[in-house]
């Protein structure tokens, strides 16, 4: 099966790489604009230059193109704890990230929030914190993992999943209660 091509892709595929078909005259192939520029005017004829202009401040194009407007630079989301890693240039969008000892949690494909890496108090680091993943902790005896924190088994309710992990401790507590002094 032939994959379905969009109109723009169909038009571009008629011309060699780095060129696009003139929108008003499909016998003319115009040279695409370099990254950092956008299309101001199509080339007037074969072998003639495309009129490309540099993107204005606050906008960019990251690859060769025949866009009529540059793309707006992204802004890092302070409300998500994001910080600017590198600022926007005419040929590259803003790069946003997190501070040291934080990781990115993606709520959706294009939205992430920065959270502090877990320190594994009352446990040990099983896997170190990474750019897109929190530390993986292993808890010491007498503690269980809840939302990536090691919590004392004394906070384990019978109905919760922790009962399996805390079973020896729970039995010990029962044992102490049951053993009367004779």
């Amino acid at each position: 099966l032939v994959p379905h091509l969009g109109d723009r892709e169909k038009r571009d595929s008629v011309c060699p790489q780095g060129k696009y078909i003139h929108p008003q005259n499909n016998s003319i192939c115009c040279t695409k604009c370099h990254k950092g520029t956008y299309l101001y005017n199509d080339c007037p004829g074969p072998g003639q230059d495309t009129d490309c202009r540099e993107c204005e401040s606050g906008s960019f194009t990251a690859s060769e193109n025949h866009l009529r407007h540059c793309l707006s630079c992204s802004k890092c989301r302070k409300e998500m704890g994001q910080v600017e890693i590198s600022s926007c240039t005419v040929d590259r969008d803003t790069v946003c990230g997190c501070r040291k000892n934080q990781y990115r949690h993606y709520w959706s494909e294009n939205l992430f929030q920065c959270f502090n890496c877990s320190l594994c108090l009352n446990g040990t680091v099983h896997l170190s914190c990474q750019e897109k993943q929190n530390t993986v902790c292993t808890c010491h005896a007498g503690f269980f993992l809840r939302e990536n924190e090691c919590v004392s088994c004394s906070n384990c309710k019978k109905s919760l999943e922790c009962t399996k992990l805390c079973l020896p401790q729970i039995e010990n507590v029962k044992g102490t209660e049951d053993s009367g002094t004779t």
Epitope: K78, E79, Q113
Partner: nanobody
Framework: EVQLLESGGGLVQPGGSLRLSCAAS????????MVWVRQAPGKGLEWVSH????????YYADSVKGRFTISRDNSRNTLYLQMNSLRAEDTAVYYC????????????WGQGTLVTVSS
Amino acid sequence: EVQLLESGGGLVQPGGSLRLSCAASGFTFEHEGMVWVRQAPGKGLEWVSHIGEDGQSTYYADSVKGRFTISRDNSRNTLYLQMNSLRAEDTAVYYCANIPKAGPSFDYWGQGTLVTVSS
């Protein structure tokens, strides 16, 4: 005690509009970023839109961009979601919540309000 109470859901025809409200109490509303999430039948939670504590910074999922508008009234401790040009795929239970601070889970959220888009 933190309480979040959503309202404004209902049955609406495709192309119609609804305005959801979320009344908040038990915390300092104006110091919290707020979010609307939704859960369609048999699907996971989807982050729909959020608004910063200042009311200026907003975000919309691609699926609702240009159709939904989030806003807040800090004097009334209320969060809103204006939903226009509704589609069948917007059918879901809508919840409001605080933007989490400590980790990627919601500390508090309401009982939700059901939005059904059907002809």
